[in-house]
């Protein structure tokens, strides 16, 4: 037999909270348990579902869970079935609703001295108790002509008068909780003695020193009083005006006039109406002083023909909002066409060259007018005034290449030389009109030049070839003083270039002819064997047809080139001893000897007491020290040539003689002993 160990029992439950109907079964064989609600099987949902044999409620619902629940156990093999006792919920709930007018049928029918009944649509179980409120203040039964019927949850006002006007709300509470009305009811019962607004003052914006008018009217029986106040609560009357409102007038109809308005008059004005009964009505209006700021500057604009462009005019800050319009040549632009105004924008469609000029954006309000010009340039493609021409420029002189163009705006001109952009430096200058100046033309300037002139609208370019007209010049100029070695072969070269290949010849400066052993071979003067008589002044003459001739004077000296008779040798000296470095040279003219030690020339006038250079060229260093060690160079020179020879000087400590060495043992290196 199937036995219920735990049976479901009826119980209190709270709307929306958890609950559990218990059911436990004992049976000899397997049974399956299910639940019935009012005789119908219960389907599992997320809210309500079987938990073992029991039925669990995640959130009790007063509508879906009202009725009788029964636990059923069934043995599917034998068909035996057992049912538990019935169980139900006593569900406690409360639900908000609106305050509604029950009597009369519509608000339009509410008149002073009629009965008005309001109903509070808050429901619940157990039945809640109700509390009524007017303008947030609790109302108690039997007070001030009203009756509260808790059972009927009604509020009755009999008779209803102006004093009952206000916002009615209700709240209810029960064992379950509390709820307040979801929508409240405004009761408005006119009282002739209460002040009512007929005309409310409006905010005004006025220009400085203009006048401002505020209108204000109230009605009531008997007629209400009216008073004006300025921000600081100072009353304004025709008899007593505050110092900053001297020019204020209050008219019989309640209007307030302010003349010659100044910044200190700006602010909030309050118009207060008071009836015989009821609260004062306060109306506010603000007086603003009109203002307009300056407009930002426009950048000049460059547009290209055929394009469509827009220029936005940002209106200046102002009160009231300034109106904006565009003008060109003193005429206001239309709102459609090819050049027109759209909103705050100037629109130029399919721009033509004739559209260039000054356009003005105007902005105006009560405070005044502002304007700002924008300069519109319509860019044109440059056109030629003078193209660069193939030119012959003279070497060494300034050369000019023109690239004269005209356009709007002024064009940018750049020059290329052999496809390389030219920068301005000491040799090249580009003038703003496009002309290229080569300050001192050189042979290698003979090449292609190209100039490009451009504006935002387009560019043009042209090129020209420069041919350099070479100067008649020596290349290189001969040295004005040269030496030849006596009794040897010698050559003196002379070469020149010019527009035409020049002829070159040598002659003696005195006009005498060259001896037969001296030949002039295409500009090279050749001496087979130099004699003393070959010394003297010679002239190299280069000439060609178009450029005439040029001369270079050369003084030739015949010399016996320098040779050393005595050369300094590698020398080692004991510290404190004297070193002698010998050097003797011969030649014609007689050579002079100089010494260089430790990479500096030894000046005979500044040698000091330890060093001396003899007439024959030898160098003596007394009392040598380790720092005197190093390389010493003997330099022999005359007006024709120079020769040098060098040797090292070593300064060593004197060794202590050993017993084994005899008194005459030689040192292991060449030594000067003094």
């Amino acid at each position: 037999a199937i036995v219920f160990i735990k049976q479901p029992s009826s119980q209190d439950a709270l709307q929306g909270r958890r609950a559990l109907l218990r059911c436990e079964v004992e049976a000899p064989g397997p049974v399956h348990v299910y639940w019935l609600l009012d005789g119908a099987p219960v389907q599992d949902t997320e809210r309500r579902f079987a938990q073992g044999s029991s039925l669990s409620f995640a959130a009790v619902d007063r509508l879906q869970d009202s009725g009788t629940f029964q636990c059923v156990a069934r043995d599917d093999v034998t068909g035996e079935e057992a049912r538990s006792a019935n169980a139900s919920f006593n569900i406690k709930w409360i639900e908000a609703g609106p305050v509604v007018l029950k009597h009369p049928a519509s608000e339009a029918e509410i008149q002073p001295q009629t009965q008005v009944t309001l109903r509070c649509h808050i429901d619940g179980h157990p039945r809640p108790t109700y509390q009524w409120f007017r303008d947030g203040t609790p109302l108690s039964d039997g007070q001030s002509n009203h009756t509260v019927s808790s059972k009927e949850r009604n509020l009755t006002l009999r008779p209803a008068g102006p004093e009952h006007s206000g916002l009615y709300s209700c709240c209810a509470h029960s064992a379950f909780g509390q709820a307040c009305s979801s929508q409240n009811f405004t009761l408005s019962i006119a009282d002739e003695s209460f002040a009512r607004v007929v005309l409310a003052p409006q905010d005004v914006v006025v220009a400085r020193y203009e006048e401002a008018m505020f209108h204000c009217q109230f009605s009531a029986q008997p007629p209400p009083s009216l008073q004006w106040l300025f921000e600081d609560e100072t009353p304004i009357t025709n008899r007593s005006r505050p110092p900053h409102l001297r020019r204020a007038t209050v008219f019989a109809n309640g209007s307030l006039l302010l003349t010659q308005v100044r910044p200190r008059n700006a602010g909030i004005y309050r118009c207060i109406g008071q009836g015989q009964r009821g609260p004062p009505i306060i109306l506010e209006a603000t007086l603003h002083l009109a203002e307009i700021e300056d407009m930002p500057l426009f950048e000049p604009r460059v547009f290209t023909a055929g394009s469509e462009e827009r220029v936005t005019c940002l209106p200046p800050k102002g009160l009231p909002e300034p109106s904006v319009w565009w003008e060109h040549a003193g005429v206001r632009l239309p709102t459609h066409g090819r050049v027109y105004q759209k909103g705050h924008e100037l629109v130029l469609a399919n721009i033509a060259e004739s559209d260039a000029g000054v356009y003005t954006c105007h902005a105006a309000n009560l405070a005044g007018q502002r304007r700002q010009d924008v300069n519109i340039t319509v860019a044109t493609v440059p056109s030629w005034l003078k193209k660069p021409q193939d030119s012959q420029l003279e070497e060494g002189k300034p050369g000019y290449l023109d690239c004269l163009t005209q356009a709007t705006p002024k064009p940018t001109v750049v020059w290329y030389r052999n496809q390389m952009l030219i920068s301005e430096d000491s040799r090249f200058e580009v003038f703003k009109n496009g002309t290229l100046r080569i300050n001192s033309v050189e042979v290698y300037d003979g090449t292609w030049y190209r100039c490009m002139s451009s504006t935002p609208a387009g560019s043009i370019e042209a090129q020209a070839r420069v041919q350099v007209l070479e100067k008649l010049k020596f290349t290189p100029p001969p040295q004005p003083q040269q030496c030849m070695e006596f009794d040897k072969e010698a050559t003196v070269p002379c070469s020149a270039t010019g527009r035409e290949k020049p002829t070159i010849k040598w002659e003696r400066a005195d006009g005498s002819s060259l001896p037969e052993w001296v030949t002039d071979n295409a500009g090279t003067l050749h001496f087979a064997r130099v004699t003393r008589d070959d010394a003297g002044n010679y002239t190299c003459i280069a000439s060609n047809g178009p450029q005439g001739q040029i001369r270079a004077h050369v003084q030739l000296t015949v010399a016996v080139f320098i040779t050393f008779k005595v050369e300094p040798e590698r020398t080692t000296v004991y510290q404190g001893h004297t070193a002698l470095l010998q050097c003797e040279a011969q030649g014609d003219p007689k050579p002079l000897i100089q010494w260089k030690g430790k990479d500096r020339i030894l000046d005979p006038t500044k040698l000091g007491p330890r060093m001396h250079i003899f007439q024959n060229g030898s160098l003596v260093i007394h009392d040598v020290a380790p720092e005197d060690s190093g390389r010493y160079t003997c330099i022999a020179g005359n007006s024709c040539n120079i020769k040098h020879t060098e040797a090292p000087l070593y300064v060593v400590d004197k060794p202590v003689p050993e017993e084994s060495e005899g008194p005459g043992s030689p040192p292991p290196y060449k030594m000067i002993q003094t």
Epitope: V302, T412, W415, L421, F431, K432, M452, P456
Partner: antibody, heavy 118, light 111 residues
Framework: QVQLQQSGAELVKPGASVKLSCTAS????????IHWVKLRTEQGLEWIGR????????KYAPKFQGKATITADTSSNTAYLQLSSLTSEDTAVYYC???????????WGQGTLVTVSA | DIVLTQSPASLAVSLGQRATISCRAS??????????MNWFQQKPGQPPKLLIY???NQGSGVPARFSGSGSGTDFRLNIHPMEEDDTAMYFC?????????FGGGTKLEIK
């Protein structure tokens, strides 16, 4: 050789104006554009504007419109920069520079220090 | 206006190494095959000196270790090898359209 010689340092009071000069030697200013550039240590270099001394046409950076006026006197081969309503923000070194129709500055003046101080 | 953004604001490079300064324009500075971007060097108490004009062309008397590259909106100044004398402020400048504008500058120092 090409040189732009600028006038000496200026110490001026706030609200005052100052006029700087830039005299060219070894070239005619009519053949070139003369530009003015402002240097402040923190802000770096700022282009003020330029003049075509031949016809007096000027172009300015928007920031310096109303603040700077560039003029030129071709007879003395000199360009000028006038700065008005001076404030501490105008304390800077001002350079003039030469440009041809190829738009780059190859030659500059040595600069003029303007100090605005009460 | 064309805005030039230079980076980095400061840079320290060892002697003999490469220094690279970048300059980005808010719009292209190219026109008719030329990039109108120039680079200047400025040392204290001296006016700026034109190093590179038209993006990649060396100014007069500028050592070969200074080179410029780039087109459109992105440009670079390279210095290699870095020398003691290169310590200075470096500015990029566009001359495509008025108003001509400069970058904020890069301070180059020896590491």
């Amino acid at each position: 050789q090409v040189q732009l010689q600028q006038s000496g340092a200026e110490l001026v009071k706030p609200g005052a104006s100052v006029k700087l000069s830039c005299t060219a030697s070894d070239f005619n200013i009519k053949d070139f554009y003369i530009h003015w550039v402002k240097l402040r240590t923190e802000q770096g270099l700022e282009w003020i504007g330029r003049i075509d001394p031949e016809d007096g046409e000027t172009k300015y950076a928007p920031k310096f419109q109303g603040k700077a006026t560039i003029t030129a006197d071709t007879s003395s081969n000199t360009a000028y920069l006038q700065l008005s309503s001076l404030t501490s923000e105008d304390t800077a070194v001002y350079y003039c520079a030469r440009a041809s129709s190829g738009p780059w500055f190859a030659y500059w003046g040595q600069g003029t220090l303007v100090t605005v101080s009460a | 206006d064309i805005v030039l953004t230079q980076s980095p604001a400061s840079l320290a490079v060892s002697l003999g190494q490469r220094a690279t300064i970048s300059c980005r324009a808010s719009e292209s500075v190219d026109n008719y095959g030329i990039s109108f971007m120039n680079w200047f060097q400025q040392k204290p108490g001296q006016p700026p000196k034109l190093l590179i004009y038209a993006a990649s062309n060396q100014g007069s008397g500028v050592p070969a270790r200074f080179s410029g590259s780039g087109s459109g909106t992105d440009f670079r100044l390279n210095i290699h090898p870095m020398e003691e004398d290169d310590t200075a402020m470096y500015f990029c400048q566009q001359s495509k359209e008025i108003p001509w504008t400069f970058g904020g500058g890069t301070k180059l120092e020896i590491k």
